[in-house]
Amino acid sequence: AITEAREEAKPYPLFPGPLPGSLQTDHTSLLSLPHTSGYQPALMFSPTQPGRPYTGNVAIPRVTSAGSKLLPPLAFKHTVGHIILSEHKDVKFNCSISVPNIYQDTTISWWKDGKELLGAHHAITQFYPDDEVTAIIASFSITSVQRSDNGSYICKMKINNEEIVSDPIYIEVQGLPHFTKQPESMNVTRNTAFNLTCQAVGPPEPVNIFWVQNSSRVNEQPEKSPSVLTVPGLTEMAVFSCEAHNDKGLTVSKGVQINIKAIPSPPTEVSIHNSTAHSILISWVPGFDGYSPFRNCSVQVKEVDPLSNGSVMIFNTSASPHMYQIKQLQALANYSIGVSCMNEIGWSAVSPWILASTTEGAPSVAPLNVTVFLNESRDNVDIRWMKPLTKRQAGELVGYRISHVWQSAGISKELLEEVGQNNSRAQISVQVHNATCTVRIAAVTKGGVGPFSDPVKIFIPAHGWVDHAPSSTPAPGNADPVLII
């Protein structure tokens, strides 16, 4: 049944009285026929535009095959123009038309907002034949109407390639306000104003908006939808919602949490992944970001040596990945390491400090006073040096590495020898005669190989030409090594 029908014009009888015996042929006078005649004014028409149906279109009178009389103009009878009902109610509406029996194969289609309604719609057409005319009633019913059923419905009938269009029946489904825009969660700066938006629609309109903050009404006088609330600033987290009211009742939006941006929590679980003599690879688990994205982090490094001056080295790094290689550290040293990260509000506190150590380093200085002799009788080269003055951090000396390069016409080859830490001399076999031998020595610890000494060259003559004078590295301050032959 039609609920809450409100008509915009008086309805016409479903079946008018008997059709006039003699029909007017003057189309002009037809236009002024009283509506109670059962006919609507005749209008010349063009094809209906989608979405903008012509109202009261009629088929122009035609001459019968016998040519004796004209048929009346055809038009749908006027019916209720506007039906207002609540969501989930049922509605039924119809259009009716009386068609002379000379017309065959009349079909009625239903259209909504310019589109034909096909398929699973509840449309029923009933025919009531009489001597001269057949009354046709096309009914359309919707069960449990929804907002999507709102719109303008019309009937169309095709006769002899002419289209007859009914007046529209406007269906207005009313219900509780429906949100088209709800407030959204935000992270905001403390004591800084921000906006929230709420929009809801009917029908029925108007829709009035109340804002609620932490269950207290912000505006006792509602605003028409849409509404923008300027929140003057918060010092702590708050929950906001908006209430939309119309004549049907109230709908409440989702509650949204507005968080206050704060400095991050300190990182946790600082871990050591790898240590070398001069670097330590660390990782950490970031703390809570304080509702604001991390910008960068700071790795703080203190040397744990009672003799150190206690200064802190600071290394800045990106917030992601949560890993950093600390470089430029002393070998074989103990360090305390902490991490702090920042967002737009500020720096977190430093993580719990952890202890880490670097490993032994390679020596930082080369052996001193390298001297090279040619021992022709034994056909070898005698090499001597002095132990370098290595720092504690370099660790314990495990030996030396000797590099000797032999060069003669177009040929060059390098050989490496390892000798123990107790030695300060070594002998190497002559590889090539009539060639130059270049010797360099480096100290070796568990931490690696130190720098090589400056090269010392000695010429190895052909057999039988002897000179026992040594070649040696110069005393400190001399620019070039001395070569004695």
């Epitope: 207290s216 006088q221 509602p222 600033g233």
Partner: antibody, heavy 118, light 106 residues
Framework: QVQLVQSGSELKKPGASVKVSCKAS????????MSWVRQAPGQGLEWMGW????????TYTDDFKGRFVFSLDTSVSTAYLQISSLKAEDTAVYYC???????????WGQGTLVTVSS | EIVLTQSPATLSLSPGERATLSCRAS?????MHWYQQKPGQAPRLLIY???NLASGIPARFSGSGSGTDFTLTISRLEPEDFAVYYC?????????FGGGTKLEIK
């Protein structure tokens, strides 16, 4: 500049009635609620309640239910406070104040002194 | 209803000094507003929503606080600042005013 202009001082006898007006200008009257605040001589401020200028619905605080009536004439952007059965203790300055979000009274009338004395 | 207690009831200071006025609520409120009233005049909004300066109010006035404890501060008193100051809460109906603090010239 937003202005709230109140009617002049009134001297009334106990049992009589008084109607105080508050005319608003330079803003859309029906957009903001109108509050009424009482200040007895030498005392602090008491919120009496407010009227929805769009719907005309009044809201009274507990101490001001009964003899106090808020009303409107939106055609002239004016709010009214009527007090009936006046008592000596109703002697006070009555203020109208524009009522905005978060219960802020951002603009005030100059006040109307109502004196109830026999 | 929420009761607002303002302290001190009277504050005697000299121009140029700093004034700190307190307002304590009987239970937590959302925001506090502050008004200034001079003799024979209507109250005037100074600070709304705890810390926001109302239109036309000099920057020497500031507000702070949350929960139940709120403060109005006048950084450097001018002769025209000597008046009565009221706090008013938002968060629970009915909205209530404090009893006022009278700021007088020492």
């Amino acid at each position: 500049q937003v202005q709230l202009v109140q009617s002049g001082s009134e001297l009334k006898k106990p049992g009589a009635s008084v109607k105080v007006s508050c005319k608003a200008s330079s803003y859309t009257f029906t957009t903001y609620g109108m509050s009424w605040v009482r200040q007895a001589p030498g005392q602090g401020l008491e919120w009496m309640g407010w009227i929805n200028t769009d719907s005309g619905v009044p809201t009274y605080t507990d101490d001001f239910k009964g003899r106090f009536v808020f009303s409107l004439d939106t055609s002239v952007s004016t709010a009214y406070l009527q007090i009936s059965s006046l008592k000596a203790e109703d002697t006070a300055v009555y203020y109208c104040a524009r009522y905005t979000n978060y219960g802020v009274f951002d603009y005030w009338g100059q006040g109307t002194l109502v004196t109830v004395s026999s | 209803e929420i009761v607002l207690t303002q302290s001190p009831a009277t504050l005697s200071l000299s121009p140029g000094e700093r004034a700190t006025l307190s307002c304590r609520a009987s239970s937590s409120v959302g925001y506090m507003h502050w008004y200034q009233q001079k003799p024979g005049q209507a109250p005037r909004l100074l600070i709304y929503a705890t810390s926001n300066l109302a239109s036309g109010i000099p920057a020497r006035f500031s507000g702070s606080g949350s929960g139940t404890d709120f403060t109005l501060t006048i950084s450097r008193l001018e002769p025209e600042d000597f008046a009565v100051y009221y706090c008013q809460q938002w968060g629970s109906l009915p909205f209530t005013f404090g009893g006022g603090t009278k700021l007088e010239i020492k």
